[in-house]
Amino acid sequence: NQDLPVIKCVLINHKNNDSSVGKSSSYPMVSESPEDLGCALRPQSSGTVYEAAAVEVDVSASITLQVLVDAPGNISCLWVFKHSSLNCQPHFDLQNRGVVSMVILKMTETQAGEYLLFIQSEATNYTILFTVSIRNTLLYTLRRPYFRKMENQDALVCISESVPEPIVEWVLCDSQGESCKEESPAVVKKEEKVLHELFGTDIRCCARNELGRECTRLFTIDLNQTPQTTLPQLFLKVGEPLWIRCKAVHVNHGFGLTWELENKALEEGNYFEMSTYSTNRTMIRILFAFVSSVARNDTGYYTCSSSKHPSQSALVTIVEKGFINATNSSEDYEIDQYEEFCFSVRFKAYPQIRCTWTFSRKSFPCEQKGLDNGYSISKFCNHKHQPGEYIFHAENDDAQFTKMFTLNIRRKPQVLAEASASQASCFSDGYPLPSWTWKKCSDKSPNCTEEITEGVWNRKANRKVFGQWVSSSTLNMSEAIKGFLVKCCAYNSLGTSCETILLNSPGPFPFIQDNIS
């Protein structure tokens, strides 16, 4: 049909944090590169109907559905979604194409469905259909990568059985220690599944998809390095593959490596050796010990020895189920208002944990760092000196762990007062929890030194939001003090604060704050 316009439908994904429902827009936000949705004419439909390719969107993602119309003259339009019509504001781009956009911010289930765009141009009328659905991430998985030997080749394949299909990369580093951090210039990344260069100092394989990134390090014993001061330990679950690499460098080729489990040599087919000359003409040998699917009896000390190097060993422990070992007893801390302080949890876990820190129903990202002794540590320093309950939660495929912390900030009491017809109450959240005194101000005691002990009731209550303690003191009104000024004072080791209250008939009460350090 000659009269049909040239139409292009695109999807634009946004990195944005606003929240809103679908809205028509002529000028969408800053975006990622547009994705062509095809927009093909739908066959056997009454009228002219174009259909864009189905759009799958993550929950909370922000997108723009956009139509570019190459037709002469003006156009008018209308969006329809779930039988509701939405305003439509076309504009023209630099190539004089009509541009119509629908912005969906923070995608939710209610915003999924069919979006119909009716366009009227001077020449013809037509409809464009977009189907937007929420991506089903419940089926998504991200599994830690594992290694396999490539058939008939001295190479390792990195495999991660994940959905959607992950991007696999090798992360290689040839220097020692700290300089092998992820963003260091010493680190080389190779986005491929097969690795032939297996002589490097540090070899890791990482898999990433929409759920994040998981890495596995090739466990290595280096006979040219002094053994680490704590026993190197490798945990695996029954059925997982075991890979340990032994590496040694010598001035010439006249040396051999062997692997032993406890005191028995590994069977043929459970190891393979590679060697190469380095740039300074020394010989590097590596000997891999591997078991394609471990059983409980593969547990034990694996020792790599050489005819020219001292032996080194690692303990391999095969477990039926994953675990998280840490002390779960709650911990209380008391710090000054400007004191630097971090919560920390030391744990041993396999497989690696996912974790969060929570305070006042708000979750914070959790970082973990491996220690030399096989333990890991997670620290949380971002408490901003807010007192209350902090929760560390960790889990892996097989285990869960929760630990509670209480943070108390040492400070002078601040007093708030309120009164009713029958009583006066004072509140304070200073720490250590304050003690209270009530004093009566009268002609006999203009400095309010006459202490009131009758009818006073003190209590401490947990302010549920933060898990923070608040102390209160209530004075029941008696005839003896009605019409007088009374003073409530809260004091702890850091100071005293007082409030003065006029005990008269009901109504608004004047309070006079009185800070005494």
């Epitope: 053994p227 026993l231 190197p232 051999g256 062997t258 406890e262 005191n263 000390y301 020792t303 020895s305 050489s306 005819s307 020219k308 190097h309 001292p310 032996s311 080194q312 060993s313 690692a314 303990l315």
Partner: nanobody, 110 residues
Framework: QVQLQQSGGGLVQAGGSLRLSCAAS???????MAWYRQAPGKQRELVAA???????LYGDSVKGRFTISRDDAKYTVSLQMNSLKPEDTAVYYC?????WGQGTQVIVSS
């Protein structure tokens, strides 16, 4: 459970001798064992070890002066240190199967 129990060590005059011993339990072969040392402010370094063909290895600075030996029946490894020098002053550690002994102080006075 692997345990390494060290004995010997102490204070000795330069030129003198000392003998260190390391008794192992839970270890299957004494040729897995070695001696390392750590001087104040320095990295731990190899002193002497056995290799997988039964021969011995020595750190460059102790060759010809120190001798490593083993008693397979008693699962004991010893280090005989002769012609000691002040620079041999260090804490000496026995190593085997990924585990370390408790460390033995050797002080060589001039």
């Amino acid at each position: 459970q692997v345990q390494l129990q060290q004995s010997g060590g102490g204070l000795v005059q330069a030129g003198g001798s000392l003998r260190l011993s390391c008794a192992a339990s839970g270890i299957f072969k004494t040729n897995y064992m070695a001696w390392y040392r750590q001087a104040p402010g320095k990295q731990r370094e190899l002193v002497a070890a056995f290799t997988n063909d039964g021969s011995t290895l020595y750190g460059d600075s102790v060759k010809g002066r120190f001798t490593i030996s083993r008693d397979d029946a008693k699962y004991t490894v010893s280090l005989q240190m002769n012609s000691l020098k002040p620079e041999d002053t260090a804490v000496y550690y026995c190593y085997g199967l990924g585990h370390w002994g408790q460390g033995t102080q050797v002080i060589v006075s001039s």
